[in-house]
């Protein structure tokens, strides 16, 4: 009997009530592997979740978060609210970054500004709550007669990783 069940492909289940006949998964259920004795209920993306991929007979639905929220956990098991740039999400809600820290993302916590002097450089542009400082040449390079520094070309700041 076990051999009959192993022949049931994904998208079906081995129906014990019908002598191990392979029956299609009922609506709103799926089986992603063969030989299953039951089909799993499809995930429903409700509330702060939105559907990224519809459920099929062989694969579960995939959820994302609605605007203003971001995913946490495997398969986006949770949605957490976004904050504004220049803020961090604490357990008591969104809070402005303290002086000397910044956050250029809508999630995560505030990061200390770069200390340019640690690499022998000077501050070219001051930091803000939303942006890190920009380091320029070393103070010695800025002595009279030295050529003026050219600010670095803007590039994409480190951003969200795909969940």
């Amino acid at each position: 009997l076990q051999d009959l069940c192993s022949n049931c492909p994904a998208g079906t289940f081995c129906d014990n009530n019908r002598s191990q006949i392979c029956s299609p998964c009922p609506p709103n259920s799926f089986s992603s592997a063969g030989g299953q004795r039951t089909c799993d209920i499809c995930r429903q993306c409700k509330g702060v979740f939105k559907t990224r991929k519809e459920c099929s007979s062989t694969s579960n639905a995939e959820c994302d978060c609605i605007s203003g929220y971001h995913c946490l956990g495997a398969e986006c098991s949770m949605c957490e609210q976004d904050c504004k740039q220049g803020q961090e999400l604490t357990k008591k809600g969104c809070k402005d970054c303290c002086f000397g820290t910044f956050n250029d993302q809508k999630r995560g916590i505030c990061r200390p500004w770069t200390n340019c002097s640690l690499d022998g450089k000077s501050v070219l542009v001051n930091g803000t709550k939303e942006r890190d400082v920009v380091c320029g040449p070393s103070p010695a390079d800025l002595s009279p007669g030295a050529s003026s520094a050219t600010p670095p070309a803007p590039a994409r700041e480190p951003g969200h990783s795909p969940q």
Epitope: L72, E88, T90, K91, C98, T101, N103, Q105, R107, G108, I109, C110, R111, P112, T114, N115, C116, L118, D119, D132, V133, V134, C135, P152, A155, R156, E157, P158, G159, H160, S161
Partner: antibody, heavy 120, light 110 residues
Framework: QVQLVQSGAEVKKPGASVKVSCKAS????????MHWVRQAPGQGLEWMGW????????NYAQKFQGRVTMTRDTSISTAYMELSRLRSDDTAVYYC?????????????WGQGTLVTVSS | SYVLTQPPSVSVAPGETARITCGGD??????VHWYQKKPDQAPVLVVY???YRPSGIPERISGSNSGNTATLTLSRVEAGDEADYYC????????????FGGGTQLIILG
């Protein structure tokens, strides 16, 4: 898929410097901060610092300030960690690890580690 | 700078539940991450931001955090869970933002 591949083992004499490389692939190198963490024999994990591969901005643990320099070459998607004035207690496995796109979460991908042995 | 305190070892029989603690002042206000470290292997992130599992980490691994203690729980432990486990937080207010606990060796009995 994301991969961080580090340079091979090094043996150095006290007072020398070592430069460990970490080549990234499978993602946009400039989009994610890179951290360095080490583990000495029989000891725990120790955070050393980070670099923003986009701007080159760094932050070092105070313990290593003045001895460590983190740099990057965006043209070859590689981060570097140089430690100078080596001592015997710098003998450790050094790891690079990627931050997942925002500060405050766990380090999601790690290099395989580089053993640095400091011995006279 | 911020200090995280872990027990040096925790012993548990196969199939039982292991709980590894990580203590710190008001750690419940911080986001705690947990790594599994096996000999001659790189650390693996098993729980991030107190209680979330990355893809590929089994559901029997979970985390919690409140007050002065964060806890990593491994239920139905297996021989393959034997490893060192480290908690970690970010402390932006200090000159050492990345802080790891001392690590806990999980010993599977029998």
């Amino acid at each position: 898929q994301v991969q961080l591949v580090q340079s091979g083992a090094e043996v150095k004499k006290p007072g020398a410097s070592v430069k460990v490389s970490c080549k990234a692939s499978g993602y946009t190198f400039t989009g994610y901060y890179m951290h360095w963490v080490r583990q000495a024999p029989g000891q725990g994990l120790e955070w050393m610092g980070w670099i923003n591969p986009n701007s080159g901005g760094t932050n070092y643990a105070q313990k290593f300030q003045g001895r460590v320099t983190m740099t990057r070459d965006t043209s070859i998607s590689t981060a570097y960690m140089e430690l100078s004035r080596l001592r015997s207690d710098d003998t450790a496995v050094y790891y690079c690890a990627r931050e997942p796109g925002y500060y405050g979460s766990g380090l999601d991908y790690w290099g395989q580690g580089t053993l640095v042995t400091v011995s006279s | 700078s911020y200090v995280l305190t872990q027990p040096p070892s925790v012993s548990v029989a196969p199939g039982e539940t292991a709980r590894i603690t990580c203590g710190g002042d008001d750690i419940g206000d911080k986001r705690v991450h947990w790594y599994q470290k096996k000999p001659d292997q790189a650390p693996v992130l098993v729980v991030y931001e107190d209680r979330y599992r990355p893809s590929g980490i089994p559901e029997r691994i979970s985390g919690s955090n409140s007050g002065n203690t964060a806890t990593l729980t491994l239920s139905r432990v297996e021989a393959g869970d034997e490893a060192d486990y480290y908690c970690q937080v970010w402390d932006s207010s200090s000159d050492h933002p990345g802080v790891f606990g001392g690590g806990t060796q999980l010993i599977i009995l029998g």
